[in-house]
Interface confidence: medium
């Protein structure tokens, strides 16, 4: 279930993941909550005085048991991912910092009268992940009232310090703040010929949508289908991006399918799960578990359930079924995507819904009897 | 180039520009066309930026300063440079570009043929290098291609004007005894072509030189003949393992 | 085993003149750039010239130039400098080091410097 | 000239930290940046070449990075054998340049 108390004054040891810089626990929180495999997270608010740049490091990590050994460390937050708490899930960061500097690669820089202005032309840059606005009181009289726009490959900061009269925070994208714009067209049959920041494997090019809108540095994909000529790339989701913010123009190219990002939609902001069970395909991936359920539908509530999976099979083949009902493979991957799709008349697959807003449950609170 | 001049559209269908996009977008090599998905280049032009999805590729483009955020370009799916390439020595500078989707062919955008493997011993006479590089030793990369004519020079004469470098015989040498033309930095990877029995070969790879078009310093080249075996070994070993990787 | 060996410093007065030698062995010696680097006591390292495996070209730094003459003998495998109208800021440990070639644009310079000697003490004092 | 600026000048670090070097050329150089280390009393030894290239011989947890401007020279876990003085040096052009140096030394 949902663990959302944090432990002061302690750090988890090991399962480690990721490390990446965060301002406060409560980012550290959310950075884990959105990391396909990071189940718990420890934050250093403080740093020993040896290893001053652990300060502010937030540790990714992961168990097969769902905890980790606790080790107390002084100045140190640790705590759970938010994966299961259904309507605390969010994407969302207004908190602003006073007298930190998030650093990262400074792509912009004009003066402004105020923070929230500054937060504001991050918001509505495309590029811009998070901000640095130096105030009036800045040391640097060249730099007063500059706001920076920042970015960077992971979408955090490279790193933070304590630096007096700057304030830093993050663009507003995620909590539907943006006023650029959102482009929903689907080019079927298109290509972008742009720079790829990376590639994933999915079902549809609206999973590939999705999967774009929640990564950091993703602004438009292309998506080849499974009858794309050259086998390696049937079912690859490739996240691009471009100088511009913009593709180029595309290239007519049979089966394949672009689109955009949907992470500057006020609107039609997707969550970051897919409902869709797809029948006739098989997910592969580290395998976690296997139970026997009756129904696909039954497979994705028990992979939901299961913390650590992030998609599933679930097999027809009269083999992989018995009495109880037919076999459900859990499983996951370094990315939360399948590391291949293959296409099997007896078998659906199907994403785990542990990131949605809203999980619909049969486990009812209340129980409301028809008359 | 130096000493060149302008190319018209179409004249060089072969040749394509090498862009790095790192902060800003640069003009950093030639290369040639030799297959819908292949490019031929120098090894040396990755050295430093050995980042696959920095490059952008651009074909049937005569003038750099038309590339624009809209131009199409294409990107690099496998990159193949000489095993016993070594920076740190002029020999075996030339590497494969293996493209992510292939090339459409137009009047502006197709191949070059590569020369037999027989041909390492062919006199050619009418040989000519293109690029966008300099136009002088210390210049800048122009807009528009640039083409030169220029004579080929025997290795053993070649290696009398180097004498602080080992010119071997996988390398070509190409260049006016007078100087004044010759190739230059950023034409680096690109085609020094020849055109023998009525059609065009692709002979050399631009590779190094002392200075640009200076008295007595030939171009050194790649010579693409001493390649065939690698180049076909290269091409066929990398839809080998295309096959192998993908989906039963 | 690449070796370089600096010999010829010492203790001269300003004005006068010290020719140090470099001797190699381990490699061919007349296939190499040659350099010579120097480091004032408790300073960082200086550039100080260069020259071409044939010795046809050399190049100085602005600070020595006109004072300083880079030489080789490729038949002794010995890299030489000679320093004349010695200053007091001429002190320093003079290295020897040999140049690796580097290709890069179109470009191919001798430029990074792989093997250094120990070094030789040359001090301009009255 | 070429001036090259190193960062820190020195640094103070325990045994299997990780250790980052910057160097800064006034004017880009392509990736023409060498770096070198030397103990006191002892000749520099060559590490890094062409911002990237790592020089036969030295051990893997050194690595380099950079183009243009902006180098970086890692340790990625520092050794007692790694103490002492790097410095950058560019061979762009003549006269070539060496940064300032970083004085490493282990806590």
């Known amino acids: 279930g949902c663990l959302s108390q944090l432990y002061a004054n302690t750090f988890f040891r090991g399962g480690d993941l990721a490390a990446i810089y965060t301002p406060d626990a409560q980012h550290c929180q959310k950075m884990c909550t959105f990391h396909p495999r990071c189940l718990l997270f420890s934050f250093l608010a403080v740093s020993p005085t040896k290893e001053t740049d652990k300060r502010f490091g937030c540790f990714m990590k992961e168990s097969i048991t769902g905890t980790l050994p606790r080790i107390h460390r002084t100045g140190a937050i640790s705590g759970h991912s938010l994966k299961q708490c259904g309507h605390q899930l969010s994407a969302c960061h207004q908190d602003i910092y006073e007298g930190l500097d998030m650093r990262g690669s400074n792509f912009n820089i004009s003066k402004t009268d105020s923070i929230e202005e500054c937060q504001k032309l991050c918001t509505n840059n495309i590029h811009c992940q998070f901000f640095t606005y130096a105030t009036k009181a800045f040391h640097r009289p060249e730099y007063r009232k500059s706001c920076l726009l920042k970015r960077s490959s992971s979408g955090t900061p490279t790193s933070i310090k304590p630096v007096d009269n700057l304030v830093s925070g993050f663009s507003l994208k995620s909590c539907a703040l943006s006023e650029i714009g959102c482009p929903m067209d689907i080019f079927q049959h298109f290509a972008f010929a742009d720079l790829n920041v990376s590639q994933v494997v999915t079902p549809d090019a609206f999973v590939c949508r999705t999967v774009c809108t929640f990564h950091p540095n993703c602004l438009f994909f292309t998506f080849y289908t499974n009858e794309w000529e050259t086998e390696s790339q049937r079912n690859v989701c490739f996240l691009k991006t471009s100088k511009s913010g913009r593709p180029s123009p595309p290239i007519i190219q049979e089966n394949a399918v672009s689109g955009y990002s949907l992470f500057t939609c006020r609107k039609a902001r997707p969550e970051p799960c897919h409902f869709k069970i797809y029948s006739g395909v098989a997910f592969e991936g580290e395998e976690l578990n296997a139970t026997f359920v009756q129904g696909a539908d039954a497979c994705q509530e028990t992979c939901t359930k299961t913390i650590r999976c992030q998609f599933f099979t679930y097999s027809l083949l009269p083999q992989d079924c018995k009495a109880e009902g037919c076999k459900c493979s859990l499983r996951l991957s370094t990315d939360g995507s399948p590391t291949r799709i293959t296409y099997e008349a007896q078998g659906s697959s199907g994403y785990s819904l542990r990131l949605c807003k809203v999980v619909e449950s049969s486990d009812c609170t209340t129980k409301i009897n028809a008359r | 180039i130096v000493g060149g001049t302008n190319s018209s559209l179409g004249e060089w269908p072969w040749q394509v520009s090498l862009q790095v996009k790192l902060v800003s977008q640069n003009h950093m090599c030639g290369g040639s066309i030799i297959g819908r998905q292949w490019i031929l280049t120098a090894a040396h032009c990755f050295d430093g930026i050995p980042y696959p999805d920095v490059w952008r590729i651009y074909g049937g483009i005569l003038n750099l300063s038309e590339i624009t955020n809209k131009t199409p370009f294409s990107s690099i799916k496998e990159l193949i440079i000489h095993q016993k390439y070594k920076m740190s020595e002029g020999s075996y500078d030339i590497a494969l570009i293996k493209l992510q989707t292939p090339l459409n062919y137009t009047e502006f955008q197709k191949p070059i043929c590569l020369p037999s493997k027989a041909d390492t011993n062919t006199i050619y006479t009418n040989c000519w290098v293109t690029g966008w590089g300099y136009t002088k030793e210390r210049g800048e990369t122009q807009n528009i291609l640039q083409k030169a004519t220029i004579p080929l020079v025997p290795n053993e004469e070649c290696q009398k004007k180097y004498r602080d470098y080992v010119i071997t015989k996988q390398m070509i040498c190409a260049g006016y005894k007078e100087g004044g033309i010759d190739a230059c930095k950023g034409d680096s990877g690109g085609p020094l072509v020849c055109k023998h029995s009525g059609r065009w070969q692709l002979v050399g790879i631009t590779s190094w030189g002392e200075g640009c078009a200076r008295k007595e310093q030939p171009g050194v080249y790649t010579k693409v003949a001493e390649y065939i075996d690698w180049i076909l070994e290269k091409i066929q070993s990398s839809k080998e393992r295309a096959l192998e990787t993908s989906p039963a | 085993e690449v070796q370089l060996l600096e010999s010829g410093g010492g203790l001269v007065q300003p004005g006068g003149s010290l020719r140090l030698s470099c001797a190699a062995s381990g490699f061919t010696f007349s296939a190499y750039s040659m350099i010579w680097v120097r480091q004032a006591p408790g300073k960082g390292l200086e550039w100080v010239s260069y020259?071409?495996?044939?010795?046809?070209?050399?190049t100085y730094a602005d600070s020595v130039k006109g004072r300083f003459t880079i030489s080789r003998d490729n038949s002794k495998n010995t890299l030489y400098l000679q320093m004349n109208s010695l200053r007091a800021e001429d002190t320093a440990v003079y290295y020897c080091?040999?140049?690796?070639?580097?290709?890069?644009?179109?470009?191919?310079?001798?430029?990074?410097?792989?093997?250094w000697g120990q070094g030789t003490l040359v001090t301009v004092s009255s | 000239d070429i001036q090259m600026t190193q960062s820190p000048s020195s640094l103070s670090a325990f045994v299997g930290d990780r250790v980052t070097i910057t160097c800064r050329a006034s004017q880009p150089i392509d990736n023409y940046l060498n770096w070198y280390h030397q103990k006191p009393g002892k000749a520099p030894k060559l590490l890094i070449y062409?911002?990237?290239r790592l020089q036969s011989g030295v051990p893997s947890r050194l690595s380099g990075s950079g183009f243009g401007t902006d180098f970086t020279l890692t340790i990625s876990s520092l050794q007692p054998e790694d103490f002492g003085n790097y410095y950058c040096?560019?061979?762009?052009?003549?006269?070539?340049?060496f940064g300032g140096g970083t004085k490493v030394e282990i806590r």
């Open positions: 080091a040999r140049g690796g070639l580097l290709l890069w644009n179109r470009e191919l310079k001798s430029n990074y410097f792989d093997y």
């Open positions: 062409a911002a990237s």
């Open positions: 040096q560019q061979s762009y052009t003549v006269p070539y340049t």
């Open positions: 020259i071409r495996p044939s010795g046809g070209r050399t």
